[in-house]
Interface confidence: medium
């Protein structure tokens, strides 16, 4: 349905004029002016303000050519002076004014609000021309109008560079409350006070804000929107919505979840990413946060030995990204391992414990008693050592690696022998006469490979010259190693 | 204080239209829904529509759009229910009904002010 | 539409005695009220919001429930309460609904 526009003022003594669909008769009364050059604005009497001057809309032509007769003021003719409807329907409303013939290529533009309304609106202006004068009506209508077409709309014509106003007619939309501010949802902490805010508009003004709490309204009357509801503090999660009220009806806010902050709950599906000797690679599944942050989080490792103290090693690390390396563990060795993450609150309880083993470890200690002597008539260096002592962690021995460097003028090279765990000698063919050979032993396990013993170096002289006397590493105390030739 | 006055008993023939009234005093008439209810004789009560008179918007009950139909003079602040082809089954008393307050929506106090009915009875 | 369902239909009861007739929604509702009607009278807001007693009702009268389930309450009958009690239902849109009646008869 189209609302029309209707005027709903008082009766306000008119000049006839009549118009073609004209809403309202004329409104043309003016003072008596003498005779103008050009245009000037004529005091006239607002009908929506009786009594008081307005000048906004009137346009005085100069005389006619045969300077006889004034032609009348223009002046829009008044119309309803306000318009209101309901959101959704449809209106029309129209602005009217009669132009004498002798002016030409009037155009009526619309405004709303201080803007001209350009492009996509219905505006249509018709003439109906007569023997002295044209009445134009322009119409503005709007099709399922919204609160964003509220405003104060006003038809503007130009005429020789001169411009008249009409009177504003307001457009008012009414409808349920529309919400500006709704309240959001919040995780808050176990009986502690906090704030919501809910705020509706119009029109029709004022609105009325009810609180309501898990279905059950809060207060008791209403309060003028905007409205802020303290909460005291929770125990219990609860679900807050506001209802706002006009005269038009009621609108409800969306729900939203106040939550309690608690303490998270375990990670689960702790796993083990990669085990070496020393370190294991973990990764956890974060549980629920207990709607607060989790801030960090806590490993915790229990060397699994009957013989251990059972101490735990406690690593703290960030809650993200949820994996963790543990480092400075035994070899050859089997842990249990759990985390446990927290958030403001507090620590959640330590997730279901999982067994995890180190490997082998490399042999921490170097082959001991390294002897190094050179064979002249096989042209090779015998090397012997003494198997070293390594601890259980260190796995199984499954061999040793020998390496020998051959220095002489300006010439560097190094080689590496690998040999059985059952030897404990082993011989190396003389790669470079007339020059030093240092050999460094390292033991190995399927762990890697140890430290390499401290070099011993030997001498291995030009063809001809030949000492029998051996090099070898020094017994356990004893300053660095001696070069024997 | 706020009054609910309805125009007087109506004998309709079937099929023929009537149009009852409903004046408000005491309050600010185009500020407030007013509903229609209908109470054929020994029975319960049945919500027929509303209309706000500031603005003219109403709202129906599904079956009875079309057969009534609500509007409102704001200068007279009377509310009107008009009923067309009517059937011996329209035989009812017919009520105006407001809320109380302008704040906010009747649906949260309910009707407040009754006017004191309009007796239709549709015979041939 | 919610429809409302009164029970019982009709009930009597002596002076003094305690009353509770119910309504019952098909879903959920926002508002409940109850209405008083006395014959050849227009009815009269008794309760409204679930548990709020209108003005001059009697303190006898108590009303209470939520979401679909509603009822009205008379703490010690009295030879005036005899009259048939309506339950009205508004959610959030129209159509508006009314239960069909209890009567209540002084026994």
């Known amino acids: 349905a189209i609302t029309e526009a209707r005027e709903e003022a008082k009766p306000y003594p008119l000049f006839p004029g009549p118009l073609p669909g004209s809403l309202q008769t004329d409104h043309t009364s003016l003072l008596s002016l003498p005779h103008t050059s050009g245009y000037q604005p004529a005091l006239m009497f607002s009908p929506t303000q009786p009594g008081r001057p307005y000048t906004g809309n009137v346009a005085i032509p100069r005389v006619t050519s045969a300077g006889s007769k004034l032609l009348p003021p223009l002046a829009f003719k008044h119309t309803v002076g306000h318009i209101i409807l309901s959101e959704h329907k449809d209106v029309k409303f129209n602005c009217s004014i009669s132009v004498p013939n002798i002016y030409q290529d009037t155009t009526i533009s619309w405004w709303k609000d201080g803007k001209e309304l350009l492009g996509a609106h219905h505006a249509i202006t018709q003439f109906y021309p007569d023997d002295e004068v044209t009445a134009i009506i322009a119409s503005f209508s709007i099709t399922s109008v919204q609160r964003s077409d509220n405003g104060s709309y006003i038809c503007k014509m130009k005429i020789n560079n001169e411009e008249i106003v009409s009177d504003p007619i307001y457009i008012e939309v009414q409808g349920l409350p529309h919400f500006t501010k709704q309240p959001e949802s919040m995780n808050v902490t176990r009986n502690t006070a906090f704030n919501l805010t809910c705020q509706a508009v119009g029109p029709p003004e004022p609105v009325n804000i009810f609180w309501v709490q898990n279905s059950s309204r809060v207060n008791e009357q209403p309060e003028k929107s905007p409205s802020v509801l303290t909460v005291p503090g929770l125990t219990e999660m609860a679900v807050f919505s506001c209802e706002a009220h006009n005269d038009k009806g009621l609108t409800v806010s969306k729900g939203v979840q106040i939550n309690i902050k608690a303490i998270p709950s375990p990670p689960t599906e702790v796993s083990i990413h990669n085990s070496t000797a020393h370190s294991i690679l973990i990764s956890w599944v974060p549980g629920f946060d207990g709607y607060s942050p989790f801030r960090n989080c806590s490993v915790q490792v229990k060397e699994v030995d009957p013989l251990s103290n059972g101490s735990v090693m406690i690593f703290n690390t960030s809650a993200s990204p949820h994996m963790y390396q543990i480092k400075q563990l035994q070899a050859l060795a089997n842990y249990s391992i759990g985390v446990s993450c927290m958030n403001e609150i507090g620590w959640s309880a330590v997730s279901p414990w999982i067994l995890a083993s180190t490997t082998e470890g490399a042999p921490s200690v170097a082959p001991l008693n390294v002897t190094v002597f050179l064979n002249e008539s096989r042209d090779n260096v015998d090397i012997r050592w003494m198997k070293p002592l390594t601890k259980r962690q260190a796995g199984e021995l499954v061999g040793y690696r020998i390496s020998h460097v051959w220095q002489s003028a300006g010439i560097s090279k190094e080689l590496l022998e690998e040999v059985g765990q059952n030897n404990s000698r082993a011989q190396i063919s003389v790669q470079v006469h007339n020059a030093t050979c240092t050999v460094r032993i390292a033991a190995v396990t399927k762990g890697g490979v140890g430290p390499f013993s401290d070099p011993v170096k030997i001498f291995i002289p030009a063809h001809g010259w030949v000492d029998h006397a051996p090099s070898s590493t020094p017994a356990p105390g004893n300053a660095d190693p001696v070069l024997i030739i | 204080q706020v009054q609910l006055q309805q125009s007087g008993p109506e004998l309709v023939k079937p099929g023929a239209s009537v149009k009852i009234s409903c004046k408000a005093s005491g309050y600010e008439f185009s500020r407030s829904w007013m509903n229609w209810v209908k109470q054929r004789p020994g029975k319960g009560l049945e919500w027929i529509g509303r209309?706000?008179?500031?603005?003219?918007?109403?709202n129906y009950k599904g079956k009875l759009k079309g057969q009534a139909t609500l509007t409102a003079d704001k200068s007279s602040s009377t509310a009107y229910m008009q009923l067309s082809s009517l059937t011996f089954e329209d035989s009812a008393v017919y009520f105006c009904?407001?809320?109380?307050?302008?704040?906010?929506?009747?649906?949260?106090?309910?009707?407040?002010?009754w006017g004191q009915g309009t007796v239709v009875t549709v015979s041939a | 539409q919610i429809v409302l369902t009164q029970s019982p239909a009709i009930m009597s009861a002596s002076p003094g005695e305690e009353v509770t007739m119910t309504c019952s929604a098909s879903s959920s509702v926002s508002y409940m009220h109850w209405y008083q009607q006395k014959s050849g009278t227009s009815p009269k807001r008794w309760i409204y919001?679930?548990?709020k007693l209108a003005s001059g009702v009697s303190g006898r009268f108590s009303g209470s429930g939520s979401g679909t389930s509603y009822s009205l309450t008379i703490s010690s009958m009295e030879a005036e309460d005899a009259a048939t009690y309506y339950c009205q239902q508004w959610s959030s849109n129209p159509p508006i609904t009314f239960g069909a009646g209890t009567k209540l008869e002084l026994k």
């Open positions: 209309i706000y008179p500031g603005d003219g918007d109403t």
């Open positions: 919001d679930t548990s």
């Open positions: 009904a407001r809320g109380g307050g302008y704040y906010y929506d009747s649906r949260y106090e309910g009707f407040v002010y």
